[in-house]
Interface confidence: medium
């Protein structure tokens, strides 16, 4: 067997995708430039990115959204990558807010998160916004990805 | 339109055994995570367990470990538990569904009576 076979690559980037739910979570897609580079790691329920291979992974999102109300009655836009583990329970990995700045129509905005952290077999890890209809789907706009170490 | 259709309810004596199927239809069902939760008479919802889309993972609430098995079969797009041992506790009506759903797309329950 191959040193290859025993490590394979494990990759992942998704696209957004706009959701008629309403659920905070964000939906993903495997469309455009993106990466899935094998069977262990796959997109579930359009929202999750779940890996089969224990080890250290680079996690990593990128959501723009749309400054598009009052700064002064507008609550901060708030990103988090979260960790859903074999045993079910769900975790904030990394969290980031920013101010709405612009009384544009439309200001963008965009919160990068990333991180190196353990994960399990099994394991899943998902993008979760205080206002999904603010996020932006165009064309390199909003990711989320991933690299095993 | 998305359907979930569970079946395989009805009375069993404790320590007996049922076993619940889920049709899916309207989605495509091997891309999805799928669980099962149930609600006893007069409480609120408790998860029992999850598998991943492709059957690899299976996940258990304490209470039903070693008693319960998840499964499921893509080519067919149906959820499975088997329930063995079962106890006057597991009586609850039992639903599948998506973990990230807010209950739009679930189905009406299969009901599960465990009864001397």
């Known amino acids: 067997m191959q040193k290859g076979d025993q490590n394979p690559q494990i990759a992942a980037h998704v696209i957004s995708e706009a959701s008629s739910k309403t659920t905070s979570v964000l939906q993903w897609a495997e469309k455009g430039y993106y990466t899935m580079s094998n069977n262990l790691v796959t997109l579930e329920n359009g929202k999750q990115l779940t890996v089969k291979r224990q080890g250290l992974y680079y996690i990593y999102a990128q959501v723009t959204f749309c400054s598009n109300r009052e700064a002064s009655s507008q609550a901060p836009f708030i990103a988090s990558l979260c960790l859903k583990s074999p045993g079910r329970f769900e975790r904030i990995l990394l969290r980031a807010a920013n101010e709405h700045s612009s009384a544009k129509p439309c200001g963008q905005q965009y919160i990068k998160l990333g991180g190196v952290f353990e994960l399990q077999p099994g394991a899943s890890v998902f993008v979760n916004v205080t206002d999904p209809s603010q996020v932006s789907h165009g064309t390199g706009f909003t990711s989320f990805g991933l690299l095993k170490l | 339109e998305v359907q979930l259709l569970e079946s395989g309810g009805g009375l069993v004596q404790p320590g007996g055994s049922l076993r619940l199927s889920c049709a899916a239809s309207g989605f495509t069902f091997k891309k999805y995570e799928m669980m099962w939760v149930r609600q006893a008479p007069g409480k609120g919802l408790e998860w029992v367990s999850s598998i991943s889309s492709d059957g690899s993972f299976t996940y258990y609430a304490d209470s039903v470990k070693g008693r319960f098995t998840i499964s499921r079969d893509n080519s067919k797009n149906t959820l499975y538990l088997q329930m063995n041992s079962l106890r006057a506790e597991d009586t609850a009506v039992y639903y599948c569904?998506?973990?990230?759903?807010?209950?739009?797309?679930w189905g009406h329950g299969t009901l599960v009576t465990v009864s001397s």
């Open positions: 569904a998506e973990p990230f759903t807010e209950f739009d797309y």
